[in-house]
């Protein structure tokens, strides 16, 4: 007996859609083998109509698809715009059509229920609005207009032109009679409920001359859209509920085991703490549509999600909804990267951000998640070099190590830097990831002077002290600009034995500027790295002033000033729409800094990693 299972009988009506789910044991082989849906012919052969390898027969073009959910051992065949010709015997299966891993499915497409002649059929989703059109003759223009609902053999009055409204329809129904000359009245029912389903009768006038029109109202609960996203990745729920609710509070909720719906986020400021730092509700368009982005997907995020509109910001019967069934694929293409990065006050962090390696040319961004109201994520830095003003000199986005990962370095950390940050690109939105920066107790490992004043035309040496644990790392100095941090030409660091027996006298890398020019003013970073992977950095600002006293200047760490206080974000910073991102409404980019000028000239700057402090001063 075949291990594949599905519905033996599927019945539907013309014009409708079916979603046929076939279940299989999720062994490694089964998960990755071909899935198919075929129709059994008179000869006994089964002709493929759609398969997981992308094949769609001409008969199914534009109206059918097959989606595999390997972790759940399920694949789904969706067929839309059914006709009676689709009635027949089918198989859903794995592998080759003629082999035994399949399941027989009978599909019956009927004309629909027998309805009175001339019945108009209205098919509407729950919570939406329907407008029932009711024609009448001229002689019935001045007479009473009414809408009845047929329940069994009786007709129940729903609304009439004498201002009667059935209590079941209170505050959500209206009867409109047009001006003279138009021989049609309409009944508009808002916020449709499942109980509104049924046969209705429009009537104008009474007696034998009355006009009648039948309307069949089918109210459907939306079939959840199946969404299959990678662990650690991102999902976007696009929610379009219609103009009728454009000005009503919106929400996204997740259905729980009690079949109620827990609010995940709404426009009234509510947010589930499980989604802290990794959710945004996009500002809605004029048509009332909005979207919700969730990053850093976890297995426990799986489930049924509903978006909707209601003044309370939560699910209520009879209000429009959209539904999704989210599955999180544990066989993720998104690499593991730390979700929490820790740094100390005054220190630094280097964050690795994954991106789709097929999109190496995409623009890379880093933004700070802000939880207020619906959440927003203003850009702090992007690969084209724009850096937000208050991050000048302490933030850089590097394309390294490349091949699906970029690096963001933030230094001069303060407690205000703690929070959630998003890595993203203007390409594949599913690769948005979240990282939390935590500020912990401790001292920075790299020590540089707080700030330095250099004299024009003279020589400047800036020491950077590192602990023994970094002795095997590559040390570098670079000059920061808003387009990155240009590494300064490094001189031979001398024999490697200098660091083998690491002691107090062999932990110094010095930057020498000789002679100092105006262009040397700016931020310099001392850092350590291993190959293309960056470690800690420390920043020092070099101010350049006119010559006062002749001679060279050496800055000793003992005379170094304290690092300047972090500039705090001005809450009034203007938001600028960022055109580079696919969904520009999701993120706002703050004021950006102009380029800070030329890099220090190559031959004038040198980096010296010496075996003793005394030797650190000279430029070789």
């Amino acid at each position: 007996k075949s291990p594949v299972f599905g519905p033996q009988e599927v019945s539907s009506v013309e014009g409708n859609s079916v979603s046929i789910k076939c279940y299989y044991p999720p062994t490694s082989v089964n998960r990755h083998t071909r899935k198919y849906w075929c129709r059994k012919g008179a000869s006994g052969r089964c002709i493929t109509l759609v398969s997981s390898e992308g094949y769609v027969s001409s008969n199914y073009a534009g109206r059918a698809n097959l989606t595999n959910f390997p972790e759940n051992g399920t694949f789904v065949v969706n067929i839309a715009q059914l006709s009676r010709d689709d009635s027949g015997h089918y198989k859903c299966g794995l592998g080759i059509n003629s082999r035994g891993l399949s399941f027989d499915v009978s599909l019956e497409v009927s004309q629909g229920p027998e309805l009175p002649n001339g019945t108009e059929v209205y098919t509407v989703d729950v919570g939406r609005t329907v407008t029932i059109k009711c024609p009448f003759k001229t002689e019935n223009a001045p007479k009473t207009k009414a809408l009845y609902k047929k329940i069994g053999q009786t007709s129940v009055l729903v609304i009439d032109s004498r201002n009667y409204v059935n209590p079941n329809y209170k505050d959500r129904i209206r009867l409109r009679i047009p001006g003279t000359g138009q021989l049609i009245f309409t009944v508009v029912i808002d916020r449709l409920r499942l109980s509104d389903h049924g046969l209705y009768l429009c009537q104008a006038g009474d007696g034998s001359n009355r006009d009648e029109k039948n309307a069949d109202l089918q109210v459907l609960e939306p079939e959840p859209e199946l969404v299959y996203e990678d662990l650690r990745g991102s999902v976007t729920f696009h929610c379009a509920l219609g103009l009728e609710v454009a000005n009503v509070a919106k929400f996204l909720c997740r259905v729980n085991s009690r079949e109620t719906c827990d609010v995940v986020i709404n426009t009234l400021g509510k947010r589930d703490s499980a989604f802290e730092g990794r959710i945004l509700l996009n500002p809605q368009d004029k048509d009332g549509s909005f979207s919700v982005v969730i990053t850093g997907l976890r297995k426990e995020d799986e489930g049924r999600y509903l978006c909707g509109a209601h003044s309370d910001g939560q699910l209520q019967e009879g209000w429009p909804i959209q539904a999704w069934q989210l599955f999180v694929n544990e066989e993720s293409t998104i690499p593991r990267s730390p979700t929490v990065v820790k740094g100390v006050a005054g220190g630094s962090v280097a964050v690795l951000c994954p991106y789709n390696p097929k999109e190496s040319q995409s623009l890379k961004y880093w933004c700070l998640w802000e939880g207020a109201q619906n959440g927003r994520c203003p850009l702090l830095v992007e690969s084209q070099g724009l850096v937000q003003e208050q991050y000048e000199g302490r933030l850089s986005l590097l394309q390294e190590p490349g091949n699906g990962t970029f690096t963001v370095i933030l230094n001069q950390l303060t407690t205000q830097d703690a929070g959630f940050y998003w890595c993203l690109t203007n390409g594949d939105t599913r690769w948005r990831t979240t990282v939390e920066i935590k500020i912990i107790e401790g001292e920075p490992n790299l020590k540089v002077p707080g700030n330095v004043t250099a004299v024009l035309g003279e020589t400047l040496n800036i020491p950077c002290h590192f602990p023994c644990k970094f002795s095997s790392y590559e040390k570098y100095w670079c000059k920061w600009s808003n387009t990155g941090c240009q590494t300064l030409p490094s001189q031979d660091e001398g024999p490697s034995e200098a660091f083998v027996n690491c002691d107090e006298n062999s932990r110094l890398v010095s930057l020498t500027l000789n002679p100092v020019t105006r262009a040397d003013e700016g931020w310099y970073w001392c850092g350590v790295k291993q190959g293309h992977f960056y470690g800690e950095t420390a920043a020092v600002y070099v101010a350049v002033e006119e010559k006062k006293v002749a001679g060279s200047r050496y800055v000793s760490p003992a005379k170094a000033d304290a690092a300047p206080d972090e500039k705090v974000l001005d809450s009034g910073v203007r938001e600028i729409e960022n055109k580079a991102i696919q969904d520009p409404r999701l993120f706002a980019e703050e004021k950006v800094v102009a380029d800070t000028g030329d890099q220090a000239g190559g031959s004038r700057a040198s980096v010296d990693s010496s075996s003793s402090e005394e030797q650190g001063g000279s430029s070789k």
Epitope: E9, V10, S19, T74, V255, R258
Partner: nanobody, 126 residues
């Protein structure tokens, strides 16, 4: 909260027929799965049949052991589901449970149903 009440159980001769009914009260849904499971004395509960309504279409599932003999039907507007059992065999003897599940997802043979009835006893004598 949804309550499920089964009826129609009883004693029947082998080869005979029986019709079980299940009524759900407490909530209206246009999209959910209702199923029948059974548990014979000393055995584990097993799937018998299920019906799923979704988007105006109906999907019916049967266990191999009852295919061709049992027929499930229902009216989702009235939240009822019936099980017509023909050609009954002594091995069909069991307590039959009605179950409802609100999610349209998941294998209907599984136990992940949200609501269960108290059960009705069907005894098939030889």
């Amino acid at each position: 909260q949804v309550q499920l009440v089964e009826s129609g159980g009883g004693l029947v001769q082998a080869g005979g027929s029986l019709r079980l009914s299940c009524a759900a009260s407490g909530r209206a849904f246009s999209q959910y799965t209702m199923g029948w499971f059974r548990q014979a004395p000393g055995k584990e509960r097993e799937f018998v049949t299920a019906i799923r309504w979704s988007g105006g279409s109906i999907y019916k599932y049967y266990a191999d052991s009852v295919k061709g003999r049992f027929t499930i039907s229902g009216d989702n507007a009235r939240n009822t589901v019936d099980l017509q059992m023909n050609s009954l065999k002594p091995e069909d003897t069991a307590v039959y449970y009605c179950a409802a599940r609100m999610s349209p997802w998941g294998d209907p043979r599984g136990n992940e149903y949200d609501y269960w009835g108290q059960g009705t006893l069907v005894t098939v004598s030889s």
